[in-house]
Interface confidence: low
């Protein structure tokens, strides 16, 4: 049959070479001459020439040896042909396989593999794969079966067995306890590979196994005992700093230090934080310390780390005495600011009060007083005792310096400490009215018609404080009752004014008498601008004489110039009398005193 | 009125120990510290260390370590320092001082001095 | 250990003098510098503390002042009383140290 079963040729042949492998041989060969060829790669085709058949005979020839790693099977086509070329069998499939020798030795895909492993692990614990190849079959043969072993770890501690790697799949675990990164930080394996399944060729790498650090360590306090003196009512003042020291890899989390007080700090004085760069644990006061109230602070404070203890490990703590120094601090007023009630207008040298200091030191130190604002200089105050005396009239009433009947004094306290210090009180004198002004009365000018004038309703003000004021009673002094009345209402708080008697145009002085309920009397004089109109006016109508008729103050210069108009007016006055023939009391005074004065003025 | 009384002279003899007492009155003897203070003839004034009678603790100056021992009697109000193996190098008037509440600060009152002489 | 250096060792000075003692620390000591008065007797007072503050019962003819490394306790107005010799002492370090020694005596 034109048929050929797959033909199997070792790889790295010795030859001689052509070497026969089989012969192709067609059945046709009884009729005719045969001629035989082959095609495919390594035949008439790259890589050509590696077989050739004999043309004649059939025989199947290898020219050079072979390399399986190269090319594993060969794929060829063998065909016959008669004499006259013509083809007298299909082409036949020739398969050629190269079968392994073991010729390649394993090799490690990394000549140094890097691993990890965290410390203090438990046997069995994965730590890295390593691989080998092996261009060898590993599939019909053992020629490129690889088997991986540990040759030798460095350094031996705490032995020399501390990993394992498995045979097949080069995967390397812990096979031992103690790993302990402190102490040996990174080991270096070196590791096998050996074809043939641990029988034949040998190569060798390095695995290098990292310990990664766990937190096995507590921070612990070099020193563990501390003592520091902190100033007194300093709030932020740094008390003092504490070390630690730890194994852990630096500036982990398992070497960061966290501190906390646990003890000693019952009034929250204090607080610790973690300095960022040093590791060091920072504790200042978060209040001002006492030294009077307590002159000493024993602290314990704990240290841990960020991380967890990976394991059960002891807590480290420090205990810190705190010595709080003696600051000279300054007086205190008690109380800070003083309430005091008052007699205003007490004579001068009368006590008002006495104001003293507290000194928080306990050291009997002296404290003198003086003061330190008195806007009205009302007051003095003894340096010793603290006594505070009159030296001016406390005036109520007095605007500038009273608000809302209270006068207020800054004092200050100083001690004879070194250096000393000085503290600062406020004295609120409340003045208690004294019945020391009289009613006035507002407006103390009017504008009144003579004819049907319009009464004057005048509002009354008194500085005093009930019961010092209203109800008010009104009198009419210097003959002033002659021409007006005044008469207060039935509240007591306005004095109306009434003309009751014509008087001519003029400016006049109404002498008026008001006093309070505590009979407090105060005279005034109210200007009063009576005019020659009827019922209500604001001004005088037109121009008017300000002579000094009727108690009125003159004019002065001003009457010179207005006598001009009133001489030039005069005449049309008499004229206007004349014709009406009419001639009232108070214009016959009017005009006499016109003409005297234009006679006045002429000569 | 604050009072530190000390117990009277001592001569002994070289290799000895001896024990000087101190005595506190009119304070709260266990909440300051007590220190001790050597004088040599016709020298200054060493700080030797010091005791919390309150808890016991005690700080020394370096060069005292192994020297002297120093302990406390809250009940009795009593501090004591202990000066063992004895040269006449130790011959000194020793002082116990109180301090003004904060340590190695200020020492506020003082105890009359007791002599020790150490001779053969 | 903090050096505290005392001048003079000592001096002679007329009742009615103002005299003044130095004493100088090896680094800065934040003014926790005290003064003890040592009378021929052998007893010791504090006489002032934290650089000028004056101990309870002390005269006001003691003062003291400086700051830094240098310090001084001044006597205004010497009486015979105050024959002694006069120590500082620093409060700032671990140990404490004292200086050296000034003996005062009358002309």
């Known amino acids: 049959d034109w048929v050929v079963a797959p033909i199997s040729v070792p790889e790295n042949g010795k030859g001689p070479f052509p070497q026969r492998l089989n012969q192709l041989k067609s059945n046709k060969d009884r009729d005719t001459k045969i001629f035989y060829s082959i095609t495919g790669p390594g035949a008439d085709s790259p890589p050509e020439g590696v077989f050739a058949v004999e043309k004649e005979t059939g025989w199947l020839l290898l020219n050079k040896p072979l390399d399986r790693e190269e090319i594993a099977k060969y794929e060829l086509f063998g065909h016959a042909v008669s004499e006259n070329g013509a083809s007298v069998e299909d082409p036949m499939n020739i398969s050629i396989i190269v079968t392994d020798q073991n010729d390649h030795k394993p090799k490690f895909t990394q000549d140094t593999f890097r691993g990890s492993v965290l410390e203090g692990v438990l046997p069995g614990t994965s730590v890295m794969q390593v691989t080998a190849t092996d261009e060898d079959d590993a599939i019909y043969t053992y020629n490129g079966v690889v088997a991986y072993s540990i040759h030798s770890q460095e350094p031996k501690d705490p032995h020399d067995l501390m990993f394992t790697i498995h045979r097949s799949t080069g995967t390397i675990s812990v096979i031992s306890s103690g790993l302990d990164r402190e102490k040996v930080p990174e080991y270096t394996l070196t590791i096998q590979a050996t074809d043939m399944d641990g029988d034949g060729s040998t190569t060798t790498a390095v695995a290098v196994v990292e310990i990664l650090d766990a937190n096995d360590n507590a921070p612990m306090f070099e020193p563990q005992k501390y003592e520091a003196w902190v100033p007194e009512n300093e709030v932020g003042h740094e008390v003092q700093r504490l070390t630690v020291t730890d194994l852990d890899v630096p500036n982990s989390p398992a070497w960061r230090a966290t501190y906390h007080i646990v003890g000693g700090d019952d009034g929250d004085h204090f607080t610790i934080t973690t300095h960022p760069e040093t590791n060091q644990g920072v504790l200042t006061t978060k209040k001002g310390l006492d030294f009077e109230a307590q002159d000493q602070h024993t602290l314990y404070v704990e240290v841990t780390n960020e991380a967890p203890f990976a394991v059960k490990l002891p807590t480290a703590t420090a205990t810190v005495v705190v010595h709080v120094k003696d600051v000279n601090e300054a007086p205190v007023f008690v109380p800070p600011s003083k309430v005091v009630e008052v007699q205003e207008g007490i004579p001068t040298g009368e006590p008002v009060c006495v104001y003293t200091a507290e000194d928080p030191d306990k050291e009997n130190q002296k404290i003198s007083y003086r003061i330190l604002r008195d806007p009205a200089g009302w007051l003095a105050m003894d340096p010793d005792s603290g006594q505070v005396t009159a030296v001016g009239t406390l005036d109520r009433e007095d605007e500038q310096f009273v608000r809302n009947n209270i006068y207020e004094v800054m004092v200050l306290a100083m001690d004879n400490g070194s250096p000393p210090t000085t503290g600062t009180g406020t004295l609120l004198l409340t003045l208690i009215d004294v019945n020391d002004h009289g009613p006035v009365p507002e407006p103390r000018q009017i504008t009144i018609c003579n004819q049907s004038p319009v009464r004057q309703v005048l509002n009354i003000t008194d500085k005093d404080l009930s019961p010092h004021t209203s109800p008010f009673q009104a009198q009419l002094t210097d003959d002033s009752d002659i021409y007006w009345t005044a008469e207060v209402n039935e509240e007591g708080d306005t004095v109306v004014l009434s003309l009751k008697k014509f008087l001519k145009q003029d400016t006049y002085d109404v002498h008026l008498s008001l006093s309070d309920h505590g009979n407090k009397e105060q005279l005034t004089v109210i200007r009063a601008t009576v005019c020659d109109c009827h019922g209500h006016v604001e001004t005088c109508p037109g121009p008017w004489k300000g002579g000094s008729g009727g108690g009125g103050s003159g004019a002065g210069v001003i009457a010179v110039i207005v006598v001009v108009v009133i001489a030039i007016v005069a005449g049309i006055v008499v004229l206007v009398i004349s014709r009406k023939k009419r001639m009232a009391k108070y214009e016959k005074a009017e005009i006499k005193e016109m003409g005297e004065m234009h006679r006045e003025l002429n000569a | 009125v604050q009072l530190v009384e000390q117990s009277g002279a001592e001569v002994v003899k070289p290799g000895a120990s001896v024990k000087i007492t101190c005595k506190a009155s009119?304070?709260?003897?266990?909440?300051?510290?007590m220190n001790w203070v050597r004088q040599r003839p016709g020298k200054g004034l060493e700080w030797i260390g010091h005791?919390?009678?309150?808890?016991?603790?005690?700080n020394y100056n370096g060069k005292f370590k192994g020297k002297v021992t120093l302990t406390a009697d809250k009940s009795s109000n009593t501090a004591y320092m202990q000066l063992s193996d004895l040269t006449p190098e130790d011959s000194a008037v020793y002082f116990c001082?109180?301090?003004?509440?904060?340590?190695?600060?200020?020492?506020?009152?003082w105890g009359q001095g007791t002599t020790v002489t150490v001779s053969s | 250990e903090l050096v505290m250096t005392q001048t003079p060792s000592s001096l002679s000075a007329s009742l009615g003098d103002r005299v003044t003692i130095s004493c100088r620390a090896s680094?800065?000591?934040?003014?926790?510098l005290n003064w003890y008065q040592q009378k021929p007797d052998g007893t010791v007072k504090l006489l002032i503390y934290?650089?000028?503050r004056l101990h309870s019962g002390v005269p006001s003819r003691f003062s003291g002042s400086g700051s830094g490394t240098d310090y001084s306790l001044t006597i205004s107005n010497l009486e015979q009383e105050d024959i002694a010799t006069y120590f500082c002492?620093?409060?700032?370090?671990?140990?404490?140290?004292f200086g050296g020694g000034t003996k005062l005596e009358i002309k």
């Open positions: 680094q800065d000591i934040s003014n926790y």
């Open positions: 001082a109180r301090d003004r509440g904060s340590f190695g600060a200020w020492f506020a009152y």
């Open positions: 934290y650089t000028s």
């Open positions: 002492q620093q409060g700032n370090r671990n140990p404490p140290t």
């Open positions: 009119g304070y709260a003897f266990s909440s300051y510290w």
């Open positions: 005791i919390y009678p309150g808890d016991g603790d005690t």
